[in-house]
Each structure stands twice: as C-alpha cells, then as structure tokens.
Amino acid sequence: MAVTACQGLGFVVSLIGIAGIIAATCMDQWSTQDLYNNPVTAVFNYQGLWRSCVRESSGFTECRGYFTLLGLPAMLQAVRALMIVGIVLGAIGLLVSIFALKCIRIGSMEDSAKANMTLTSGIMFIVSGLCAIAGVSVFANMLVTNFWMSTANMYTGMGGMVQTVQTRYTFGAALFVGWVAGGLTLIGGVMMCIACRGLAPEETNYKAVSYHASGHSVAYKPGGFKASTGFGSNTKNKKIYDGGARTEDEVQSYPSKHDYV
C-alpha cells in the first residue's frame, strides 16, 4: 500500500514539476528590468528564452522573437538546450511511469517489469529536474554577472552632461517557477526510485527438506515463498490512484491591460 502511494505521489509530483518546467521555458519573464535605484521609466522591459518584450505604461506591449540562432549568446543556447532536454526526458519519464503505475493493469505485466519501468522513469525525472535547475541557475548566474557589469558603468555620458541610463535586468518570475518545478520533478523522481525498491520482487528460496514421518512416506516441500511486500494478487480494497494532477500553467497574468510601471 505504501509503495503504491509513494509511486502515485511521485508520479503526481513529477507531473506538476514537468508542467512547471514547460511553463517556465515558455514564459517571457526570465529577466525583468530592475526598477530599484533606477529612474522611474514609463517603459518596462522583460526577456524570455525565445523573445524579448516591452510593456509601456499606456498598456501597449510589444514582443519580438529572437529570429537568429547564430547571433545568440552561447549561454542562452545552452539554457534553451537544458530546458528542452529536461522537458523531453520528463515527458518520456511520464509516459514510462504511466505504464509502471501499480494501480494500472496492462496485460500480465510482471512486477519486476513494473519495478524496472518505475526506476527508469524515476531516473528520467531526476535528470529532467537537474536539467531544469541547471538551466535556470546558468541563466541566473548570467544575470548576476551582467547586473554587476552594468552597475559598474550604469551612467555613461558625454562630458558628464548627457546621461545614458543603462537598463539593468534582475530575476524574472520564470526563474522561480523553473527552480520550484525542477525541484518538484527531482523529488518526484526520487520518490519513484524509492517506490521501485518496494516493487521489486525479492525472491527468498528455501531448499526443499524431506520430513519422514514414521509409517508415512510423505515429503513436505515448501516452495520458494515470495518475500512479503504486502502486494499479493488480492486486489480487494486496493486504493486506485488516478494520477489526475492539476497542472498549473504558472504563466504570469498581469493585473491590468496597461499595468503601471
């Protein structure tokens, strides 16, 4: 029972995590304009992995995609790759784990096969979560580096008269979504691996011993008993986990059509 719960919960947690990784990857707010200690502008800039956006105080928002591959920073490409790998691994992991779920019967699938599939999906979730966490962390590191670089030469001017304000960027909502989602996927993966240990049929074979009773020649041969895992063929009172997790889109909804910046 505990193994089914662990497996089911691991699946649900991973599902939410992967949905979050997908949401974070698609979000535009990976980096947002730093408003602290900056002149108040009537324009708010924010950037994602795929496009950069500008929201004016008037409400007009314009987003432009990065229509180049070669012209983009290698770090951004690396982050994109890590997030996509994370999503792909997570999606495959979800597919595998659906068939591995103890509460779902597919033909006469052996418990050992389910255990292997659970372990495989668990490892996939762990790697998926690590990819997402790595991707978000690389991007965050890039932001921190750029932030201090732009702070060092925040105001560059011609003879000190005309000033040019350099836009500084700080952590966007997508980073936090990515970190949490990656963590959830990682936890889900660990739970799947733990569940796998309980699912694996540990064979404890006892050698056949003959007991000779006087006057009878009857041999009692105890068979190889399965180690008690609490999961026999008796399906009575078995808790069915439907795995129907609420997937939250996590995409930021703005409070207004022309948000005050």
């Epitope: 304009q33 002149p39 108040v40 502008t41 009537a42 324009v43 800039n45 924010y46 950037q47 950069s52 956006c53 500008v54 004016e56 105080s57 008037s58 409400g59 007009f60 314009e62 432009r64 005309v162 000033q163 040019t164 304000v165 350099q166 836009t167 409070p255 207004s256 059509k257 022309h258 948000d259 005050y260």
Partner: antibody, heavy 118, light 113 residues
C-alpha cells in the same frame, strides 16, 4: 469616432475646489490610460500625470502631488481631475488626453479653462 | 526631471520652404529593449488642443501629412517639414515619453512671413 468631451469653464476663488470631467466615447474606456495636461495662459504644456483606467491607479508628476487628484467613473466612461485649495497659479486650461502606444497622447479633449480669482 | 530643450524658440518661414526644428533631452530616450526612442512631437494651433504628429521619434500618426518627418536617436531629435503650408502655422512641442514625469519642451513657434 474617438471623442473626449470636457466640462465647461470654471471660475473659482482661492482656497476653493474644482472638479473637471472628461467623458470618453468611441473606444473602450478601460483599455487606455488617461493623462492630464496643464497649460497656463501664453505658456507651454505641463504633464500632470495619468490614471490607469483599468485599475484606477493614478500616477502624479511631483509638482502636482498633494492638491491634485485623478478619479474615474468607469460606468459613465468619465475621468475626473480635482484640484483642492486653489491658488492663483492654478489659472490655466486643463486638457485630458488618451494615453496610447509609444506613451503618446493621441486624442485630446477640447480643454477646460479654470480661472482662480478673488 | 528630464529637461527637454527646443530650438529655435521661433521660426519665420515662407510657404513651400523646408523647415527643421530641434529637440534635445538631458538623458537618452532610447529604450534598449525594443531599440525605440520615446519621443513625441505635437502641433498646437491657436485656441486648439495639441495634435499628435509623431511618436517613437519617427513614426507618423495616421492622418498626418507625409511632409512631417521625425528623426534622431538618443538625446538629439529633429522635426522636419519638407514644404511648409499656411495651415502649419502653430507651436510644435516635443515630449519625453520615457522617464516620469513625461516632460514637454518649451515649444517652437512657426510663423509665416
């Protein structure tokens, strides 16, 4: 077509309060911000601030913080400018203008003349 | 506050002539996010409210004659009227639309000889 119709001219004594209205038509009122601009006689334009017509959040220029208040009556598609404790230097024409793309003011009211005199 | 300096303060021209007026801001109005300059030009005729001519420094508002052209970037901007007409007699204002408060220039008065 898009129209911003402002209330008529006002004559007030110093220390009094005036409330100017700006009724919008021809566009969805809550999709664009509303700005207010002051023009003293024979002088240039001075931006007073704007109000987010969706959330009702106002933003004031430093020179107009305190005595000036922007408000809305969304159901009537009307924006209001209220000036308290009027001074002689408040004598001016006040314009409401729609805050649009590029943060530009693309449609203006005809203006409301406010005269403060004892 | 951002200071918008317009020059000249007044211009006297003849019909058909090409006119150029300048607007300088104390800080760059170029937004790095979309590479757009947040500067607007308005025309105000006597007894009328201002009329939007150009936004984003060079984008002409619909219905504005193509003889009006906006140019410039960063801190230096120019409004050009390729062939002045009698109806262009007005005061022209530039406005900073990037930093709060959204300050206006003092204006350039266009007069006909």
């Amino acid at each position: 077509q898009i129209q911003l119709v402002q209330s008529g001219p006002e004559l007030r004594k110093p220390g009094e309060t005036v409330k100017i209205s700006c009724k919008a038509s021809g566009f969805p009122f809550t999709t664009d911000g509303m700005s207010w601009v002051k023009q003293a006689p024979g002088k240039g334009l001075k931006w007073m601030g704007w109000i987010n017509t969706y959330s009702g959040v106002p933003t004031y220029a430093d020179d107009f913080k305190g005595r000036v208040a922007f408000s809305l009556e969304t159901s009537a598609s009307t924006a209001y400018l209220q000036i308290k404790n009027l001074k002689n230097e408040d004598t001016a024409t006040y314009f409401c203008a729609r805050f649009r793309r590029g943060n530009a003011l693309d449609n203006w009211g005809q203006g409301t003349s406010v005269t403060v005199s004892s | 506050d951002i200071v918008m300096t317009q020059s000249p303060s007044s211009l006297t021209v003849t019909a058909g002539e090409k006119v150029t007026m300048s607007c300088k801001s104390s800080q760059s109005l170029l937004n790095s996010g979309n590479q757009k300059n947040y500067l607007t030009w308005y025309q105000q005729k006597p007894g009328q409210p201002p009329k939007l001519l150009i936004y984003w420094a060079s984008t002409r508002e619909s219905g504005v004659p193509d003889r009006f052209t906006g140019s410039g970037s960063g801190t230096d901007f120019t409004l050009t009227i390729s062939s002045v007409q009698a109806e262009d007699l007005a005061i022209y204002y530039c406005q900073n639309n990037y930093f709060y408060p959204l300050t206006f220039g003092a204006g350039t008065r266009l007069e006909l000889k």
